[in-house]
């Protein structure tokens, strides 16, 4: 079965049930429902999933049975619309149920919430978790899927199955260990961090497809797969890009059963043809399905073929450039991107796409000129500043990171971004700046050849978080502009923003800077977030404050927290010393 199966199935639900198996079918339906109805209780979702599963089984037994010929969107949408509290819980989302497919599904998709009002997941004690795991393993794992899916409505569903498998393995191993906590907690931390990263990466893919279209996603995929598989032929890369686009379009569109099925087919195809694709796939292809697909998605770049010819000959020096371009624009540009990317694993994907866009723009202009060859002869010279800009930026920021360390580097970014876009909510600025700051420990350790693809493509993922959060409640024209004008120029657009001179400083509110003894019991990370929240608020009150002024206030604040957390009467200390600190800070900043 290729990814493009066109064989007719009387019953789509039976087809997917048979392809995926009952366990994966149920898990994927649960993910789909939780990603659509993010506020519904777990038990309600489980009930709906069981009803759909029982129905699917009747269709497997007889594909001609009543309603078995309905589309999955119709079946799932009808099921979601049976939820009694839809109007009370979701408000206008209930109006989706008055629509017909495909409008109804589009309506549900539009109501997915990137920042749902849900309580933070608190990790119970290890013994409590192990007991719950042993008492009812199936419910325990379903709960994991449900809690992740509802908080991350664009999480890549087949990949979430892989995370759940690792989650189960962690509990199976560690709940029998002598020191359960020492075994389990690092594994859960790793899964949490990897899960957040996976969610953010997939969110960018969906944004790329939904906001900028299939062509934008395909260009991204051509560049990335050409870097990863530089020995593969262009047609092989093109086939993989077409299939990968189908997989991600399905998952981003809520078609999770089709997506998982097609992803499995794609992994099968890649492994059957690995000799024509990459020498690095051997180990991946020996793994079971979920691990195999994950491994392929993360596989390292293959070695570049030796003696690749110069690109200038055919893309610049040839007199046939315009003829070639006119004959088949997308194929010609696709080949340019493929040829450039396979030669440059040291470039970020977004840089490669900027170069391809510059090349396209030049040909559009020059092929209509009196002397096209003379016009486009220097096009490669235009690439130089585009390449140097991210190189210089990464060099400067890695030097700053090495000088400051992660926490203080995050603080520098908090100040920088709050001054650029002070209208953005404080929690969003803290979350995004903290993530931007993680680029240091993630990428600066790499040699030069790996720094740019690591850093700039990671920054694209983080800035997309800012864009999707801002889109929910837009407050800044500058953010909207950087987010919507060009996908590949988002990072340079944000980098180029200076202090927002139009911003009217926020009124001073002493309550914002009032702290209590509960800060002393927080984890180091939570304590950092509290301090960074205060820092953002300070900048919002005094956007013209200098680095030195802000540093002095933050140092005083750190000393104040440390002092009061050591005091016998912590709450009194926080009340009295806090007042002094606020007064001293106001004086220092001239508030």
């Amino acid at each position: 079965r290729g990814v493009f199966r066109r064989d007719a199935h009387k019953s789509e639900v039976a087809h997917r049930f048979k392809d995926l198996g009952e366990e994966n079918f149920k898990a994927l339906v649960l993910i789909a429902f939780a990603q659509y109805l993010q506020q519904c209780p777990f038990e309600d979702h489980v009930k709906l999933v069981n009803e759909v599963t029982e129905f699917a089984k009747t269709c497997v037994a007889d594909e001609s049975a009543e309603n078995c010929d309905k589309s999955l969107h119709t079946l799932f949408g009808d099921k979601l619309c049976t939820v009694a509290t839809l109007r009370e819980t979701y408000g206008e989302m209930a109006d989706c149920c008055a629509k017909q497919e495909p409008e109804r599904n589009e309506c549900f998709l539009q109501h997915k919430d990137d920042n749902p009002n849900l309580p933070r997941l608190v990790r119970p004690e290890v013994d409590v978790m192990c007991t719950a795991f042993h008492d009812n393993e199936e419910t325990f794992l379903k709960k994991y899927l449900y809690e992740i899916a509802r908080r991350h409505p664009y999480f890549y569903a087949p990949e979430l199955l892989f995370f759940a498998k690792r989650y189960k393995a962690a509990f199976t191993e560690c709940c029998q260990a002598a020191d359960k906590a020492a075994c389990l907690l690092p594994k859960l931390d790793e899964l949490r961090d990897e899960g957040k990263a996976s969610s953010a990466k997939q969110r960018l893919k969906c944004a790329s497809l939904q906001k900028f279209g299939e062509r934008a996603f395909k260009a991204w995929a051509v560049a990335r797969l050409s870097q990863r598989f530089p020995k593969a032929e262009f047609a092989e890369v093109s086939k993989l890009v077409t299939d990968l686009t189908k997989v991600h379009t399905e998952c981003c569109h809520g078609d999770l059963l089709e997506c998982a099925d097609d992803r499995a087919d794609l992994a099968k195809y890649i492994c059957e043809n690995q000799d024509s694709i990459s020498s690095k796939l051997k180990e991946c292809c020996e793994k079971p399905l979920l691990e195999k697909s994950h491994c392929i998605a993360e596989v390292e770049n293959d070695e570049m073929p030796a003696d690749l010819p110069s690109l200038a000959a055919d893309f610049v020096e040839s007199k046939d450039v315009c003829k070639n371009y006119a004959e088949a624009k997308d194929v010609f540009l696709g080949m340019f991107l493929y040829e450039y990317a396979r030669r440059h694993p040291d470039y970020s994907v977004v840089l490669l796409l900027r170069l391809a866009k510059t090349y396209e723009t030049t040909l559009e202009k020059c092929c209509a000129a009196a002397d096209p060859h003379e016009c486009y002869a220097k096009v490669f010279d235009e690439f130089k500043p585009l390449v140097e800009e991210p190189q210089n930026l990464i060099k400067q920021n890695c030097e700053l990171f090495e000088q400051l360390g992660e926490y203080k580097f995050q603080n520098a970014l908090l100040v920088r971004y709050t001054k650029k876009v002070p209208q953005v909510s404080t929690p969003t600025l803290v979350e995004v700046s903290r993530n931007l700051g993680k680029v240091g420990s993630k990428c600066c350790k790499h040699p030069e050849a790996k720094r740019m693809p690591c850093a700039e493509d990671y920054l694209s993922v983080v800035l997309n978080q800012l864009c999707v959060l801002h889109e929910k409640t837009p407050v800044s024209d500058r953010v909207t502009k950087c987010c919507t004008e060009s996908l590949v120029n988002r990072r340079p657009c944000f980098s180029a923003l200076e202090v927002d001179e139009t911003y009217v400083p926020k009124e001073f509110n002493a309550e914002t800077f009032t702290f209590h003894a509960d800060i002393c019991t927080l984890s180091e990370k939570e304590r950092q977030i509290k301090k960074q929240t205060a820092l953002v608020e300070l900048v919002k009150h005094k956007p013209k404050a200098t680095k030195e002024q802000l540093k002095a206030v933050m140092d005083d604040f750190a000393a104040f927290v440390e002092k009061c957390c050591k005091a016998d009467d912590k709450e009194t200390c926080f009340a009295e010393e806090g007042k002094k600190l606020v007064a001293a800070s106001q004086a220092a900043l001239g508030l």
Partner: nanobody, 125 residues
Framework: EVQLLESGGGLVQPGGSLRLSCAAS????????MGWFRQAPGKEREGVSS????????FYTNSVKGRFTISRDNSKNTLYLQMNSLRPEDTAVYYC??????????????????WGQGTLVTVSS
């Protein structure tokens, strides 16, 4: 009408060399993919080497890597295959083929759209 005409085949001793040519007419090279395939008696047609007329990237099947070199002259609309260190197992009819770079894959002859009649290469002492 597209025509691909191969030449340069013949009898050669093991360790010897040959240079095959393929003259294309009825279409300009432009953005295309050109390839050499071979078919030994009683065997399936297999890809030997391919080249893009734009970018100039080349691909070879493992058994000929380091021995064969594909090249093209866009101005003459001609494709070449320089074959060195020939072995008896290289004996076959060699075909020139052309197609779209977005489709043509060396391991799959059906992805090439146009074919020549073939030229016989015999490696024997």
């Amino acid at each position: 009408e597209v025509q691909l005409l191969e030449s340069g085949g013949g009898l050669v001793q093991p360790g010897g060399s040959l240079r095959l040519s393929c003259a294309a007419s009825g279409f300009t090279f432009l953005t295309s993919c050109m390839g050499w395939f071979r078919q030994a008696p009683g065997k399936e047609r297999e890809g030997v080497s391919s080249i893009y007329t734009v970018g100039g990237s080349t691909f070879y099947t493992n058994s000929v890597k380091g021995r064969f070199t594909i090249s093209r002259d866009n101005s003459k609309n001609t494709l070449y295959l320089q074959m060195n260190s020939l072995r008896p197992e290289d004996t076959a009819v060699y075909y020139c083929a052309a197609g779209s770079p977005a489709r043509c894959r060396l391991r799959d002859p059906t992805t090439f759209d146009y074919w020549g009649q073939g030229t016989l290469v015999t490696v024997s002492s």
